[in-house]
Interface confidence: low
């Protein structure tokens, strides 16, 4: 699909061109960078208004559209893997051209947090309503669309071009036609402005192919940002018309004299420029000389001007223009401070939030706080940080630090803590005994007891648990001589395995392990080798586990 | 060529319902907004409201809620206006006309009128 | 609402001379370089017929003896050289804000 130019609007230092055609985004982008201009900005109401009116007029040269509603590219967009930044009126996306973040924006609807694909921005209009202030085109973010698939209800785009200045657009004494040709391929046979570069033709007469006479002129810059087409006079002046047809072609005033002949003239306090038709204000701030959103202000008797800058902004070398002043260097920010036009902004450091007295104060963020703790136990709040701490019975864990895993304290540096079989649980440990044996009162050393084929003795009652002193979490495995069922062992979520000393008497037997709270209970058998998995809460080796793990604090441990 | 067809008039009681209609042809139907407006014995044009043929979106005269629903038969190509709880403050000409589809939405093709007359 | 205000109510021109008729909206009916205003022109016993839309663009097959002009609040419909055929009634209407409003209307006579 191609797109038709069917519409152009100039205007300051731009001009807008409207196109139709369902294209992508970067497709769209490419046809206005081929002529030397990008997917529109809508930096401002002024510039939205403007936009609106280009639009406007290539919905009027279009055939009637049948869609209510009908999107048009401009050039807003947002990388992939760039994720929205809610406090930013352009939240995150930026103009193709390049360019600072601006503070004007109309989003059509609250914008979803999304990293995933390249995002694009489309002017939503509704086409049923008149162009009214309340209905500036709404900012629409979507799928930038692909060849082929150009994106959902996509109509068109709007292109903008910048130019040094423009012309003013030549004026008819008599019947003609006046061709423009921009540099940017459009012809149009009016423009409220005329960019620096054009070409008109001019073509008198009223139709008649003898009568015809043709001019060619070029839009120049004449004096610095001063531009025109290098005429002098009216053209196509008739003396059939006189000053009848368009006022002689003249700006202001025109004079008739009794041969048909005329000449044109300005008001009081107005001289006529070199090319005898335009009129300028006598007053020196009437040619616009200061520039870059300085004000233009006039000198005593109304002889000269200087030029004054808005807040933010100082005159630069010219004394015609403004720049921004670097109010950063003045250190106003308690941590950093950020340079934009017209002003600056203060930010915090990482750990640090606005707040506290004075203006551009930073106060500590409380990572710790009730509901926003890091930490999957322990949480110490520090100054533009914290640290995380973990209760007896675990250690720091994790890529940041703020997991706790199990110390698994049967296979601890000193060697095993029980005599024959050792159980490691979340936080703590018991001991057992192999069959014939009984454990003895320390909770660690076996006696000889009865003789009895059955399994290993179980778990000690609640009162004589091998656990550590102190230690306040929940036992996460126990172990029993109870077996699965139809006697067939399972696999269990633990990673931990009860251990064996290397020189007791071993008789196999199942034991059911109790999953952490929340998993399904399985079962696994005695291993007679050390564990090497390393313990504590560990995701499932991969397949299709059924066993769920969980930190002890329902944390997911991110930070 | 562009033609709104309306019905020369119709006698209605008061109290009572009426459906005028509008006949649309020369032109893709569902390209334009189809409007009403009212305009009483020697009086000045009032707008009812509009309806998009396309969608059958509507857009009323607050004044005219009510009292007037607009609706199509996109098959046919027609528009219609039902006026409701008849008095003689609705004997009018009522036109239906045209616009384009977006921006500046002016009428430039009307039908000739259809005269409600509310009289017992 | 924006209320329409035309003047005068009626007048009489002579064949071949300027017909000038006023219409006055409560509020600016202009956006964005156009103006919403349109003048439409009835005869009796006819729907009223488009002339001028946006202000000052004459409709196709209206002669150019009918200019509009004006922007903001302040409308005017010229007709220069008034024709026989000109005698009529004739509208401003805004199209600039729901709901869409007419003026009072202006009788033309030709004397």
């Known amino acids: 699909t191609g797109a038709d130019t069917e519409a152009v609007v100039c205007v300051g230092t731009a001009c807008y061109t409207a196109h139709s055609g369902k294209l992508s985004a970067a497709e769209a982008q490419n046809h206005c960078n081929q002529n030397g201009g990008n997917l529109a900005t809508v930096k401002s109401k002024e510039e939205a208004q403007h936009v609106q009116r280009v639009l406007a007029q290539l919905l009027r040269r279009e055939a009637a559209l049948t869609a209510r509603m009908s999107k048009f590219w401009i050039g807003l967009q947002r990388e992939k893997g760039k994720c929205l930044d809610p406090s930013l009126p352009l939240k995150g996306f930026s103009w193709v051209g390049g360019g600072e973040d601006t503070p004007y924006s109309n989003w059509h609807k609250e914008l979803r947090n999304s990293c995933i694909s390249k995002r694009c921005v489309s002017l939503l209009l509704d086409l049923s309503q008149p162009l009214l202030p309340s209905r500036l085109p709404k900012w629409s973010e979507g799928p930038c669309g692909s060849p082929g698939s150009p994106g959902s209800n996509i109509e068109g785009f709007v292109c903008k071009f910048s130019f040094k200045g423009m012309c003013r657009p030549l004026a008819l004494g008599g019947p003609g036609q006046v061709t423009y040709t921009t540099p940017f391929q459009t012809t149009s046979s009016s423009l409220e402005a005329v960019p620096f570069a054009s070409a008109a033709n001019v073509a008198c007469g009223e139709g008649d192919k003898d009568e015809t006479q043709s001019h060619y002129f070029l839009c120049k810059e004449k004096a610095p940002d001063v531009f025109d087409w290098g005429s002098s006079g009216p053209l196509c002046v008739s003396p059939k018309y006189g000053c009848n047809f368009n006022n002689g072609g003249c700006h202001q005033d025109c004079f008739e004299g009794g041969d048909g002949s005329f000449l044109c003239g300005c008001r009081p306090g107005f001289r006529l420029l070199d090319d005898l038709v335009t009129c300028a204000s006598r007053n020196p701030c009437s040619s616009s000389p200061c520039r870059g959103g300085a004000t233009c202000v006039l000198g005593p008797h109304g002889k000269n001007y200087t030029c004054r800058c808005p807040q933010g902004y100082q005159l630069d070398s010219s004394q015609l223009d403004c720049v921004d002043v670097d109010e950063c260097q003045d250190s106003p920010c308690a941590q950093e401070c950020v340079n934009t036009p017209g002003g600056f902004r203060c930010e915090c450091w990482v750990g640090y939030e606005p707040g506290g007295p004075g203006e551009g104060a930073c106060q500590d963020v409380d990572e710790c706080a009730l509901g926003r703790s890091p930490c999957a136990q322990g949480c110490t709040n520090t100054d533009g940080s914290f640290h995380c701490s973990c209760e007896e019975g675990y250690v720091l864990a994790g890529e940041d630090g703020t997991q706790c895993q199990d110390v698994d304290e049967c296979v601890g540096p000193g060697g095993p803590l029980c005599d024959s079989l050792c159980f490691n649980t979340q936080g703590s440990f018991h001991c057992g005994c192999l069959p014939g044996w009984v454990l003895a009162p320390n909770g660690v050393s076996c006696t000889m007891g009865p003789v009895s084929l059955g399994p290993p003795s179980g778990p000690p009652d609640e009162e004589d648990k091998g656990e550590k002193e102190g230690s306040t979490v929940p036992r996460a495995a126990t172990a029993s001589p109870t077996r699965g069922p139809e006697g067939t062992p399972k696999a269990t979520p633990t990673t931990s395995r009860p251990s064996l000393s290397s020189d007791a008497p071993i008789t196999s037997a199942p034991l059911k392990m109790l999953a952490p709270s929340g998993s399904p209970g399985v079962w696994r058998e005695p291993s007679i080798h050390h564990a090497t998995a390393a313990s504590g809460p560990q995701e499932p080796a991969g397949g299709d586990s059924s066993v769920a793990t969980q930190n002890n604090d329902g944390t997911d441990g991110q930070k | 060529q562009v033609q709104l067809q309306q019905p020369g008039a119709e006698l209605v009681k008061p109290g009572a319902s009426v459906k005028l209609s509008c006949k649309a042809s020369?032109?893709?139907?569902?390209?334009?907004?189809m409007h009403w407006v009212k305009q009483r014995p020697g009086q000045g044009l009032e707008w009812i409201g509009e309806?998009?043929?396309?969608?059958?979106?509507?857009y009323y005269n607050q004044k005219f809620k009510g009292k007037a629903t607009l609706t199509v038969d996109k098959s046919s190509s027609t528009a219609y206006m039902q006026l409701s709880s008849l008095t003689s403050e609705d004997s009018a000409v009522y036109y239906c006309?045209?616009?384009?589809?977006?921006?500046?939405?002016?009428?430039?093709?009307w039908g000739a009128g259809t005269t409600v007359t509310v009289s017992s | 609402d924006i209320v329409l205000t035309q003047s005068p109510a009626s007048l009489a021109v002579s064949l071949g001379q300027r017909a000038t008729i006023s219409c006055k909206a409560s509020q600016s009916v202009d956006y964005a370089g156009d103006s919403y205003m349109n003048w439409y022109q009835q005869k009796p016993g006819q729907p009223p017929k488009l002339l001028i839309y946006?202000?000052?663009n004459l409709e196709s097959g209206i002669p150019a003896r009918f200019s509009g002009s004006g922007s903001g609040t302040d409308f005017t419909l010229n007709i220069h050289p008034v024709e026989e055929e000109d005698a009529a009634t004739y509208y401003c209407q805004q199209t600039n804000e729901d709901p869409r409003t007419f003026g009072g209307g202006t009788k033309l006579e030709i004397k």
């Open positions: 006309a045209r616009s384009v589809y977006y921006g500046n939405k002016y009428f430039d093709v």
């Open positions: 020369g032109y893709t139907f569902t390209s334009y907004w």
């Open positions: 946006a202000a000052s």
């Open positions: 309806i998009d043929p396309s969608a059958s979106y509507t």
